[in-house]
Interface confidence: low
Amino acid sequence: VNAIPDQCSPLPCNEDGYMSCKDGKASFTCTCKPGWQGEKCEFDINECKDPSNINGGCSQICDNTPGSYHCSCKSGFVMLSNKKDCKDVDECSLKPNMCGTAVCKNIPGDFECECPEGYRYNLKSKSCEDVDECSENMCAQLCVNYPGGYTCYCDGKKGFKLAQDQKSCEAVSVCLPLNLDTKYELLYLAEQFAGVVLYLKFRLPEISRFSAEFDFRTYDSQGVILYAESIDHSAWLLIALRGGKIEVQLKNEHTSKITTGGDIINNGLWNMVSVEELEHSISIKIAKEAVMDINKPGPLFKPENGLLETKVYFAGFPRKVESELIKPINPRLDGCIRSWNLMKQGASGIKEIIQEKQNKHCLVTVEKGSYYPGSGIAEFHIDYNNGSNAEGWHINVTLNIRPSMGTGVMLALVSSNNTVPFAVSLVDSTSEKSQDIVISVENTVIYRIQALSLCSNQRSHLEFRVNRNNLELLTPLKIETISQEELQTQLAILDKAMKGKVATYLGGLPDVPFSATPVNAFYNGCMEVNINGVELDLDEAISKHNDIRAHSCPSVWKKTKNSEDQVDPRLIDGK
């Protein structure tokens, strides 16, 4: 019998995987090295997939190799001495100035160069650069970019305000509808801030005498109702109001007179007034009762060539007349006349003239007060410096308001460099049906009086005083204010402005940049303003938009529901 050859020769085992080969009778046994398996140790064991030792015990990456495996780490991590666990590398500590002027922030396996909000990191320059959000069309109307941010603005003068998303614009809505009904039979005497409302010329037979009858309604205390003169300006008659009473001034070749009399008629009621030239006097009647009789030696106006020619001006007089008056008068008069009959000619021609001109029509119902329609401003020059006051300048303001729209600038001081060092504005609150009052220095809100129901039948009363050291609210309200340090910084800005020239604006702002104040819409509603103890009379303004009514305020359209007719009791004006 032939001997059975050695089964381990030639070697049947996988050279890489075997440890030893044992010859058996007509068979062999391969003993495998660790990491190999199979009859011939030809198969590598994948330790990374071993269910009894998940991921080969590696904390991050398990790399299988023939007959073995090893652990490795992801980028930004280093292997610990146990050759299994990885640890994050803090790149920010290892490499200073990794991010240049930006802030280096370590993150697992990496680092980030962080910039403040509104800035973007530039890899090349290793610095933070301002993001120009305005180039990304973030705003609906106007966008102002500044380092680190941007602000959207809406054109308040066109009736827009910033929406809650601080990007889009929405129309400032009416919160208290007013009765703006007018009648063409009622002639509005304050259509022009400066100038005559109506001019008529009469050519009548020489036997005619001057006469004027009309119903008159006003809350204004001073102004010109009617001025009449001869064609050659040699004689004139002025019918005016002073201190709420009728005043007559007249001048002709015979005499020069001024008389005031009768009851106060600036009571907002219709008063029937008649002025009639009699043979030896001029008779003035109110409600058909004689209140004045002015003696005159001859006719008021001298006829020429058989004709009496007379020019009549409503609510004003020609500019040159001002210097001729016996007693100067502010001609501006916010009032209405109706049922007029001039020179005994009835209403001839006048109704036709005014019928087509809406702005010559008077409101059917008015209340006492001043009305800002949301289309313009009034300008005053007020000296806030008080020589006797150690504090220097001071501003004591009382506002009585009944807004019709919930957003708008009520009062603003504007410097000659077009900044707005002080403004008091109204803004629709985030809470429904209420408004905030915002007091600002330039573009910084220093006080916010929150969630007041101001759009109400009731007038609201707000009182505050400001000097270089303090802003004090005298009406008891819940306010949100900036820190005392920040307030002092802002008051210092105001103090600097007050040492220069400031103009006072009511009802809005002149042409200043949108970004000059937090609010730029015109105020719409009724408002009376008292500054440093003086009630501001819009007839005395340096300039005033024609639509602002100095002494009349439209009535509320209809009674709102009780729930909507609430106003914070601390604001109620009892004056």
Epitope: Q458, L474, K478, T481, Q484, N562, P569, D573, G574
Partner: antibody, heavy 119, light 106 residues
């Protein structure tokens, strides 16, 4: 629940001094506006003084009849308001109430403490 | 300073009877506040903003205004309504109260 508790009343001679205290609870005291109102048979209800919250720098206001004689103060850490009364007169006699002034004015009142000024 | 005049100073009413007391101020543009006070207790805010009842005040109470005259009305008097009622208006400092109307049950 809002609670206001006055203390410190009693009998004092004309020209003398007295300090009233009011301990408050049940609301954010530092923001609150607090006041004192007194009541006497002769004068009825009469507002005396008011002190505003932190946001208003604790501004104080007084009725003409007590100006210069009475001082209102507060300690926000103790949720307390005080009324220091000097140069007391017979007409200052009455029940002094501590009030929380909210949007509805004198919305909450304490039970009152009685001051008698008499020789 | 507002002067508030309450009338009548004292009145009495039978159970079920309608009661009206008035308070005259200087201004019709202000809201009126009413307080109820019972002997030995402090005043309690009863009606605010002229016509709104404080929570818990019976619906038989109402407040109204006519010109510068303000009224508190009880539609049907009950024994528990016997108290002194004070009116108050606010027009800046000082805060002012009316002299009170003492309502007794007959």
């Amino acid at each position: 629940e809002v609670k206001l508790e006055e203390s410190g009343g009693g009998l004092v001679q004309p020209g003398g001094s007295m300090k009233l205290s009011c301990a408050a609870s049940g609301f954010t005291f530092s923001d609150a506006w607090m006041g004192w109102v007194r009541q006497s048979p002769e004068k009825g209800l009469e507002w005396v003084a008011e002190i505003r919250g932190k946001a208003n720098n604790h501004a104080t206001y007084y009725s003409e009849s007590v100006k210069g004689r009475f001082t209102i103060s507060r300690d926000d850490s103790k949720s307390s308001v005080y009324l220091q009364m000097n140069s007391l007169r017979a007409e200052d006699t009455g029940i002094f109430y501590c009030c929380l002034i909210t949007a509805f004015l004198f919305d909450y009142w304490g039970q009152g403490t009685t001051l008698t000024v008499s020789s | 300073q507002i002067v508030l005049t309450q009338s009548p100073a004292i009145m009495s009413a039978s159970p079920g009877e309608k009661v009206t007391m008035t308070c005259s101020g200087r201004s019709s543009e202000n809201y009126m506040y009413w307080y109820q006070q019972k002997p030995g207790s402090p005043p309690r805010l009863w009606i605010y903003d002229t016509s709104n009842l404080v929570s818990g005040v019976p619906a038989r109470f109402s407040g109204s205004r006519s010109g510068t005259s303000y009224s508190l009305t009880i539609s049907s008097m009950e024994a528990e309504d016997a108290a002194t009622y004070y009116c108050q208006q606010f027009n800046g400092y000082p805060y002012t109260f009316g002299g009170g109307t003492k309502l007794e049950i007959r």
